[in-house]
């Protein structure tokens, strides 16, 4: 996860009611019994602020020691912090639990602003309106951090829910979905919706509001309208998908899909924008401008670096163009379309206390290590991380926001011939392929 | 040609709030863009505030939240209301109109300008 335009976490209001939902089609392929249908005491167990990330309650513990943990799709340890900070209300603490185990050993985890280290365990651990299971999961806990923690954010540690593969210090520290699955019944899948508000809130506002829901198991049909559709996992580290096609506003960006996905393309909700490689994002731009240059903006919106502000209520959303991803399918040759709208990528600016304005800053930015597919994308969408099968089901999603003229959408199938070729190869740079 | 006079401009208590207006007059060349820019005691001339064509909006971002900026319907007069004022605030504040540009809070960007309105904040 890249740590530093982390993701946005708003309230649920704003989008299609729930249970309000399209037939459904028949043509899906059933799924393993208990995985679907209803989970209805996890539904909501999200919340969270625009830009900050979005949180669950777990505990940590005996007696239990109840914390607020972001949900980053995009790192691979649990980590809370476990000594005072000045933006932590609480923290871990260790020799108040019965059932720590010290491993005796360090972790160190540097970002690219920032860092974080502490010192690796295990406790008991819960999650109170997920499964009802308790099991014994690795803990990182943080000692000191820099540029990590979030003041007002609300959230005190952090869920790494990818693959052993990129957990610190290295892939023999399982991760907490591997030990959840390895320890219960609990199915080897988790479902993510994330509601963004489509305007800001004030700290009360968040506190009282929904952020969306983690369905740990399952797949909760209430969250979604239409059909799911799967792109396979390319590789288990990150959540890895390739990205086959981008179009702005039924535009195809016409560039070689590899750079799409150079040097790779991740799902990850702990990142708040949308972000792209450097070749990809100057192009979307350029289209972008062009499609809304009804308007101006200043240079600096398009770097994320100015807010665009309109009279309340005026915001001309239908000046600026839908965005689509075409992601490679499960079948050969065949693709599905994931679109969304400028209120997903248009990101309401909380500090903006005037009523008399709604302010945005641009939510896609640039990356110099691959696609990031951050909470811009996953606000639009159901996000089903079937682990067990390999692959990343999207369905449009029941809190997305939109206006009476557009929706996000998620549609297929689509012919696209040689997908395999849009993946980029990371060259290997252990010392096993240096040949001398 | 064009002229601009702003208006609004006093004394103030640490928290208080003030409205400033600025009236164009003259020339009937549209200009699209409009801002106002500060200049406090012993430091630069910077972007408060910007406006093009009386909808889209941006702000300094340090001043973000407090103030908003805004046109009348015929965009002959310009305002900034300012909330939550600190002593920090205290500057000439100027008004400023021209054809723009991709930095809409570069002085540079603006063609014509008032002669400004003071704003003292008082602690």
């Known amino acids: 996860t890249q740590h530093g335009i982390r993701l946005p976490l708003r309230s649920g209001l704003g989008g299609a009611p729930l249970g309000l939902r399209l037939p459904r089609e028949t043509d899906e392929e059933p799924e393993e019994p208990g995985r679907r249908g209803s989970f209805v005491e996890m539904v909501d167990n999200l919340r969270g602020k625009s830009g900050q990330g979005y949180y669950v309650e777990m505990t940590v513990g005996s007696p239990p020691q109840t914390l607020n943990i972001l949900v980053d799709t995009g790192s691979s340890n649990f980590a809370v912090g476990a000594a005072p900070h000045p933006f932590l209300h609480r923290y871990y603490q260790r020799q108040l639990s019965s059932t720590y185990r010290d491993l005796r050993k360090g972790v160190y985890v540097p970002y690219t602003q920032g860092k974080w280290e502490g010192e690796l365990g295990t406790d008991l651990v819960s999650i109170p309106h997920g499964p009802n299971v308790t099991v014994r999961a690795n803990i990182a806990a943080i000692t000191e951090s820099d540029k990590f923690f979030i003041n007002g954010s609300n959230w005190e540690g952090i869920l790494g829910l990818a693959y052993a593969e990129i957990a610190r210090p290295d892939d023999s520290l399982e991760p907490f979905f591997d030990s959840l699955v390895k320890q219960t019944h609990v199915p080897n899948l988790f479902s993510l919706q994330l509601c963004g508000a489509g305007f800001p809130l004030n700290q009360s506002e968040v506190l009282a509001s929904v952020g969306g829901s983690m369905i740990i198991g399952g797949i909760d049909h209430s969250l979604y309208t239409g059909s799911l559709w799967y792109t396979p996992i390319r590789r288990e580290w990150y959540y890895e998908v390739i990205i086959v096609r981008v179009e702005i506003n039924g535009q195809d960006l016409k560039m070689d899909c590899k750079e799409y996905n150079y040097d790779k393309s991740i799902v990850d909700s702990g990142t708040t924008n949308l972000r792209l490689p450097k070749k990809v994002f100057e192009a979307a731009v350029k289209s972008i401008k062009a499609a809304s240059s009804t308007e101006k903006f200043p240079d600096g919106f398009w770097l994320g670096e100015q807010l665009v502000c309109w009279q309340a209520g005026t915001t001309p959303w239908n000046i600026f163009p839908v965005i689509s991803l075409y992601l490679m399918g499960e079948v050969t040759n065949q693709s599905f379309r994931i679109t969304i709208l400028p209120q997903q990528y248009l990101r309401p600016v909380e500090d903006v206390a005037t009523s008399q304005d709604d302010c945005y800053k641009f939510a896609i930015s640039q990356s110099s290590t691959g696609t990031v597919m951050g909470a811009v994308i996953m606000e639009g969408f159901y996000v089903v991380f079937d682990r067990a099968r390999k692959r990343i089901g999207f369905a449009v999603s029941a809190c997305h926001v939109h206006d009476e003229f557009r929706t996000a959408a998620v549609e297929g199938p689509f012919v696209t011939l040689d997908m395999e070729d849009c993946g980029y190869n990371i060259p290997q740079t252990d010392e096993s392929t240096l040949m001398t | 040609d064009v002229q601009l006079q702003e208006s609004g401009g006093g004394s103030v208590q640490a928290g208080g709030s003030l409205r400033l207006s600025c009236a164009r007059s003259g020339g009937t060349v549209s200009i699209p863009y409009m801002a106002w820019f500060r200049q406090g005691p012993g430091k630069e001339r910077e972007g408060v505030a910007a406006?093009?064509?009386?909808?889209?909006?941006t702000y300094a971002g340090s001043l973000q939240g407090r103030f908003t900026i805004s046109q009348d319907n015929d965009k002959n007069t310009l305002y900034l209301q300012m909330n939550s004022l600190k002593p920090d605030d205290t500057a000439v504040y100027y008004c400023?109109?021209?054809?723009?540009?991709?930095?809409?809070?570069?002085?540079?960007?603006?063609?014509?300008w008032g002669k400004g309105t003071q704003v003292t904040v008082s602690s």
């Open positions: 406006i093009y064509d009386g909808r889209a909006k």
């Open positions: 400023a109109a021209g054809n723009g540009g991709g930095n809409w809070l570069r002085p540079s960007e603006y063609n014509y």
